[in-house]
């Protein structure tokens, strides 16, 4: 209440950039905190199907828009067959998970591995068997699965037939796919993520053309895609809430990604306003309809009125509250390359703690799962990834401070990623795994990097001990 009254920012995220120590929610007095995370803190690690599975056309899997994009847009990359081959080496992934000692494993289901042309008919048996075996193995190990339904690998057939996410027909098709997954896997899955970082799907898939399907320059298409992603998520949430939650008793959210930004001049109201607009145009675009009032942020509605679709009154009611926790992604994909429109002439920053405070203020202090966090190293770095350790320590320290000093309700952390793999537009030029994989080897051994040892220790100690 005090914050709202004094800053004049109505309790919104702009208070974060106030450098008056009485009013800013972030207390900068402790740069490093030696403390533990809350008891039963949820430690995990994640992968994306397209990045690690390989076997892009094996055992009846259909092509995805990324398989196609790799062949048509990315130089010097023949296919994701050269990745860490998780589809073949499932046991090696499980051993890697055992080594670290995580509480959960976040992975995504490849939609075209289950349904080659995207339409829910009879599932591809080998694909179904793969995910079922993985889930059984995780349950056996007491590792909680967090399952993402869509991590960018749209069945190519849906792109070619309907124009992909530009067409609202896909909303019902996605819901059918989700229904199938709930039916087949919901007995073993208590945490579901509908879509991973829809901002990047829309912005880079249809704006910059840096992601599949590689369309560019059509702002109306960007926001139509965003709109359909939000509506698809909402439809699936209501479906789960009505038909599956009563007996499966799980939780469902959508992973939203963002950068962080600092004003050029911390005392300048216009710069602070630009920082707020920057966060709103990336994170608020999706968070406001789902975690906020059910509509797009007012600033976006005014600025983009000619290209931003509308939510009707009924849809606003349908959208809002369709997430059981706030799943937040904070990593390189939202920073490089950064949308210059979103930057607004201000300074990007890797301050995860402040980003978490912004979410707390904007969306009424939700429970937060860090659903993706980490950095990257050059592809030449093998197992001695000191930069990755430095970044992990920094990020985890910020999360701990957010919990202990700012009373932010972070309940879990997903280190990204379990394995080196295919890194989207960067292909194999960077590595994000805690386990090193030699992509040219036959056996694709998972070798723990220094960061894997470090994360293992953090989990064992539940934080930073003196």
């Amino acid at each position: 209440i005090l914050l709202r009254a004094v800053t004049g920012f109505s309790g919104d995220g702009r208070a974060i950039w106030s450098k008056n120590p009485n009013f800013t929610p972030v207390n900068e007095s402790q740069l490093f905190l030696y403390d533990t995370f809350p008891k039963n803190f949820f430690w995990g690690i994640g992968t994306g199907a397209l990045q690690v599975e390989g076997s892009w056309k094996k055992d009846g899997k259909g092509p995805s828009i990324w398989d196609h994009f790799i062949h048509t847009h990315l130089k010097n990359v023949s296919s994701t067959n050269g990745s860490s081959d998780s589809y073949i080496f499932l046991e090696k992934d499980l051993s890697a998970l055992d080594f670290i000692g995580v509480s959960f494993y976040q992975f995504s289901i490849s939609w075209p591995r289950l349904f080659p042309d995207g339409i829910v008919t009879v599932a591809n048996a080998k694909g179904l068997q793969y995910y079922s075996t993985l889930l059984d193995a995780l349950v056996l190990r007491n590792i909680e699965p967090i399952v993402t339904l869509y991590h960018w690998d749209l069945p190519l057939a849906l792109q070619e037939k309907y124009g992909g996410w530009k067409n609202d027909t896909i909303i019902d098709i996605f819901n059918d796919y989700a229904t199938y997954c709930f039916q087949m896997f919901g007995d073993r899955v208590k945490y579901w993520i509908t879509i991973h970082n829809p901002y990047l799907v829309a912005w880079h898939g249809y704006g910059t053309g840096m992601h599949a399907p590689g369309e560019k320059g059509n702002l109306a298409a960007v926001y139509t895609v965003g709109h359909n992603l939000i509506k698809a998520h909402s439809k699936v949430w209501h479906n789960y809430n009505t038909h599956f939650r009563p007996h499966q008793k799980g939780w469902l959210s959508i992973t939203l990604g963002s950068h962080w930004i600092e004003p050029n001049r911390s005392e300048n109201t216009m710069d602070i306003f630009k920082c707020q607009q920057s966060m709103v145009s990336v994170l608020g675009w999706f968070a406001n309809p789902i975690h906020g009032d059910g509509d797009y942020p007012e600033g976006m509605r005014k600025k983009l009125f000619s290209v931003l679709p509308i939510f009707s009154e009924a849809e606003k009611h349908e959208m809002r509250g369709t997430a059981d926790f706030f799943a937040f992604s904070f990593g390189p994909n939202n920073f490089k390359p950064l949308n210059t429109m979103a930057k607004m002439g201000q300074n990007v920053s890797l301050n995860l703690r402040e980003a978490l405070n912004w979410i707390k203020l904007e969306y009424n202090n939700p429970r937060i799962l860090i659903a993706e966090n980490g950095w990257f190293t050059d592809s030449r770095v093998k197992t001695e990834d000191t930069t990755a350790i430095y970044m992990m320590k920094n990020f985890l320290s910020q999360v701990l401070q957010a919990i202990r000093l700012d009373e932010i309700r972070v309940f879990g952390y997903t280190a990204w990623s379990l394995l080196d793999g295919f890194e989207w537009q960067d292909a194999y030029t960077i590595r994000r795994g805690l386990f090193y994989v030699d992509f040219n080897s036959k056996q694709k051994e998972r070798k723990p990097k220094s960061s894997a040892h470090y994360y293992k220790q953090i989990i064992r100690e539940n934080g930073f001990s003196l």
Partner: antibody, heavy 115, light 107 residues
């Protein structure tokens, strides 16, 4: 299956209040909105207001000072109260299950405002 | 408020005919647009929602189209039971508004 039914007083004196109850079955009021619509004799339809699953309400701006919509989820009932009635409030009053469309309507209840 | 101008206000057609009813909004309503049928006994049912989607149980001879400000309802192969008044409806902006109605008579 979904059913919607209005029950009202039939005749109301001018300056008095009108109360109508809409009883629904086949769906939950916690999940869906219900709108009130009226139709004066021989004329078109006029939307009055909606109460949503979460309890929030939108009223027609022309009636906001006289109209109150409430509900009782446990009884599956929605209530309309219109104050200070005049002759041109004479109409058939309908309630309807609401999304971005009215997919199920009641049969309507005729309300005549007359001394 | 968004005004909905419906034309014609009445029409008469023969069994088997194809008829079209039009509705024009005073501003862009982004396909948030519906059609209803009111029978002579007063019962109302939804025919078409979101401009062109056929409500479950409605015969396929009813179809809707349009965008922006202009929308239409087409009934092909007219049947006796189609004698009714048809209303258009926008939900783009509050307050939601209806067209004045089109009374369809069968010759």
């Amino acid at each position: 299956q979904v059913q919607v039914k209005e029950s009202g007083p039939g005749l109301v004196a001018p300056s008095q209040s009108l109360s109508i109850t809409c009883t629904v079955s086949g769906f939950s009021l916690t999940n869906y909105g219900v709108s009130w619509i009226r139709q004066p004799p021989g004329k078109g339809l006029e939307w009055l207001g909606v109460i949503w699953g979460d309890g929030s309400i939108n009223y027609h701006s022309a009636l906001i000072s006289r109209l109150t919509i409430t509900k009782d989820n446990s009884k599956s009932q929605v209530f309309l109260k219109l104050n200070s009635l005049e002759a041109d409030d004479t109409a058939t009053y309908y309630c309807a299950k609401t999304h971005d469309w009215f997919d199920y309507w009641g049969q309507g209840t005729l309300v005549t405002v007359s001394a | 408020d968004i005004q909905m101008t419906q034309t014609p206000s009445s029409l008469s057609a023969s069994l088997g005919d194809r008829v079209t009813i039009n509705c024009r909004a005073s501003q862009d309503i982004s396909n948030y647009f519906n059609w209803y049928q009111q029978k002579p006994n007063g019962t109302i049912k939804l025919l078409i929602y979101y401009t062109s989607r056929l409500q479950s149980g409605v015969p396929s001879r009813f179809s809707g189209s349009g965008s922006g400000t202009d929308y239409s309802l087409t009934i092909s192969n007219l049947e006796q039971e189609d004698k009714a008044t048809y209303f258009c409806h926008q939900v783009r902006t509050l307050p939601w508004t209806f067209g004045g109605g089109t009374k369809l008579e069968i010759k």
